[in-house]
């Protein structure tokens, strides 16, 4: 008799793929307009990325550092009207994209939570949650919670409101902290909270260090659902050397949890891509017309248009990974096992029951090496085969689809591989 199938875990929509942050509408649209109506026109693009949720804003009225002039129930007219927002929600729903609204109160000001009047602000947030839930929003984000006094208890209260409305509503908290203990104390008091932090950007970007960060985090959080990003708001390029971008895309999409990206991460957008632009709001490079000030040779391969036409581009890799992440059970909710790793590299297996299994091998170093993978530290349920099929490499030149001998596996500098192999009873 065939072994009994494992019961599938309950999967919320944010478990099924990546979240995509658009913190600055003007930067994202890159055409000087930057409003909700314009954003609607980019939903097809977001669909093509197979992202499950759009983390939007903040877009509410906020007079810099003025509590009274901050209204979380009103959309800043520069971004559009409530009707525009309702229309965006409706269009997004049709494309199965959920909208998560950033309600960080004083986003234009010095201290995101104002330095005083914490209770007043917390009440405003509470009212806003109830208001926007009724309006059809799928979730909320609040950032810089290290600046919010008694953050844990407020988050618990806000979580109760969102979950009380529906189990299908999400609350994301963001912190600049990279300290595991601080992160854990925030998570402990809030079940189901998705927390973005600077935890991974605390890395020296070696395979050994990244492996220890990831495994420590997973061990400490137990079977709680994680999110993976390098910061609560910034671009990957602000934290990573360029040669590791592809590697991190592969890792973020294949670790157990929800990957969270900022607009532009999919094309390797850099914060100062266009001179004169503020670092926090880089202009999204849709095509060559996004380069009003520079005519850099090869600028086409930095744009969405250019990269869409190139199967070897970062954008193409992002799309492929996002697609795999959203449809393969082992990547959706599979178990995770790290393998013993050599210098500069980190490898792990994702597996779920009798479904196809995935092996990820990441070489963070700039020296090619023999990975020589052996299953010495794996449980029987996750045993390694002699060969696995190459699904993708982060670098050109590999023969995708071909079987690779795992004991003789050799990686190029900064290369990541995603391999697949079948369950064998």
């Amino acid at each position: 008799r065939a072994p009994r199938c494992r019961d599938l875990p309950v999967q919320k929509w944010w478990h099924t793929g990546a979240l995509y942050r658009i913190g600055d509408l003007q930067g994202f649209q890159g055409n000087g307009a930057g409003n909700l109506a314009g954003l609607k026109g980019h939903l097809d693009y977001l669909s093509s990325l197979k992202v499950k949720g759009l983390v939007l804003g903040p877009i509410h009225k906020n007079q810099k550092d003025d509590v009274a002039g901050t209204d979380l129930l009103q959309i800043d007219p520069n971004f559009g009207s409530k009707e525009d927002f309702a229309s965006l929600l409706q269009s997004a729903k049709k494309k199965s994209i959920r909208i998560i609204l950033d309600l960080t109160p004083n986003y234009q000001g010095e201290n995101s939570w104002f330095s005083t009047q914490v209770d007043t602000v917390a009440t405003k947030v509470k009212d806003a949650l109830e208001f926007w839930l009724q309006a059809g929003v799928d979730g909320f984000q609040v950032r810089d919670i290290e600046n919010l006094k008694d953050a844990s208890s407020f988050l618990a209260e806000w979580q109760n409101i969102t979950k009380g409305f529906s189990e299908d509503r999400l609350l994301i908290a963001g912190t600049n902290s990279s300290d595991l203990q601080q992160i854990l104390s925030l998570l402990e008091s809030n079940k189901d909270l998705l927390l973005t932090s600077s935890y991974l950007s605390n890395s020296s970007f070696t395979g050994e260090h990244t492996k220890s960060l990831v495994t420590q985090y997973l061990n400490a959080t137990g079977n709680r659902w994680c999110s993976w990003s390098l910061s609560q708001a910034g671009l990957l390029t602000s934290f990573l050397p360029a040669q590791l971008l592809r590697l991190y895309q592969l890792m973020l999409f294949t670790l157990p949890g929800t990957p969270v990206f900022s607009y532009g991460d999919e094309i390797g957008l850099e914060a100062a891509a266009v001179p004169g632009q503020p670092v926090e709001a880089p202009v999204m490079l849709w095509d060559e017309s996004s380069f009003p000030f520079i005519s850099a040779a090869g600028s086409a391969n930095m744009t969405v248009k250019g990269q869409s036409e190139d199967p070897g581009s970062l954008l193409s890799l992002f799309r492929r990974l996002s697609d795999q992440r959203s449809k393969e059970r082992s990547l959706l909710h599979g178990d995770f096992h790290a393998l013993s790793s050599g210098p500069g590299f980190f490898s792990y297996i994702r597996h779920w029951d009798q479904n196809e299994r995935f092996l990820v091998v990441l070489n963070f170093g700039d020296v090619g090496l023999s990975a020589g993978l052996q299953a010495s530290d794996l449980p029987a349920s996750a045993s390694l085969p002699a060969k696995a099929d190459l699904l993708l490499s982060t670098q050109p030149g590999r023969d995708e689809g071909s079987p690779l001998e795992l004991e003789r596996l050799k990686l190029e500098p900064h290369e990541g591989l995603l391999l697949r192999f079948p369950y064998v009873a």
């Epitope: 040669q243 050599g342 020296v367 090619g368 090496l369 030149g397 500098p413």
Partner: antibody
Framework: EVQLVESGGGLVQPGGSLRLSCVAS????????MHWVRQAPGKGLVWVSR????????RYADSVKGRFTISRDNAKNTLYLQMNSLRAEDTAVYYC?????????????WGQGALVTVSS | QSVLTQPPSVSGAPGQRVAISCTGN?????????VHWYQQLPGTAPQLLIY???DRPSGVPDRFSGSKSGTSASLAITGLQAEDEAAYYC???????????FGGGTKLTVL
């Protein structure tokens, strides 16, 4: 057939400069990391410098840091080594070397070498 | 003084087996970096003989084999032939020097 041909070697006085070139053929030059390795007369091999495929990642041996500069022109399939403030101990045959792919960063093809003599 | 230590010379009669050792430390071979071997015939440029500890490039006879264990590696040549007379170099990467390192070379004499 893979070929690496060095040129630019010669006699130079201490403190002087020299620029070595290496023209590559028989492979897609722009896809490979490249190295310079030297060998003093009657001695062993010593690694000098390495550059990645697009020129954005560069490494030097401590003995040449600040004096030598590696660069490449992928359009011309050419690797360069600019050597300044030369010393007597820099006297050697300089080999242009290709780093293999999927070989654990081994050095899979070597040029015939260019002799650099630093003497007054 | 080379970072990787090789015997300066080894010798053997035709048909015999010889082995050349290469000893490093925990920042190169012992750290898990690959060891490669090169053959340099008199008056010529070096040629890759073994890569990735034990793999042979095409064209290299199977009389040549490589192995690695801990902080050292070894090159074995069986069925020694006159044309094997050459200098042999091991090479790895060193993380503390952040560079490629070679052994001092071993001169093989076929008696």
């Amino acid at each position: 057939e893979v070929q690496l041909v060095e040129s630019g070697g010669g006699l130079v006085q201490p403190g002087g400069s020299l620029r070595l070139s290496c023209v590559a053929s028989g492979f897609t030059f722009s896809s490979y990391w490249m190295h310079w390795v030297r060998q003093a007369p009657g001695k062993g091999l010593v690694w000098v410098s390495r550059i990645n495929s697009d020129g954005s990642i560069i490494r030097y041996a401590d003995s040449v840091k600040g004096r030598f500069t590696i660069s490449r022109d992928n359009a011309k399939n050419t690797l360069y080594l600019q050597m300044n403030s030369l010393r007597a101990e820099d006297t050697a045959v300089y080999y242009c070397v290709r780093e293999g792919r999927y070989t654990g960063s081994s050095l899979d093809y070597w040029g015939q070498g260019a002799l650099v003599t630093v003497s007054s | 003084q080379s970072v990787l230590t090789q015997p300066p010379s080894v010798s053997g009669a035709p048909g015999q087996r010889v082995a050349i050792s290469c000893t490093g430390n925990n920042s190169n071979i012992g750290a898990g970096y690959d060891v490669h071997w090169y053959q340099q015939l008199p008056g010529t440029a070096p040629q890759l003989l073994i890569y990735g500890n034990s793999d042979r490039p095409s064209g290299v006879p199977d009389r040549f084999s490589g192995s690695k264990s801990g902080t050292s590696a070894s090159l074995a040549i069986t069925g020694l032939q006159a044309e094997d007379e050459a200098a042999y170099y091991c090479q790895s990467y060193d993380s503390s020097l952040t560079g490629w390192v070679f052994g001092g070379g071993t001169k093989l004499t076929v008696l």
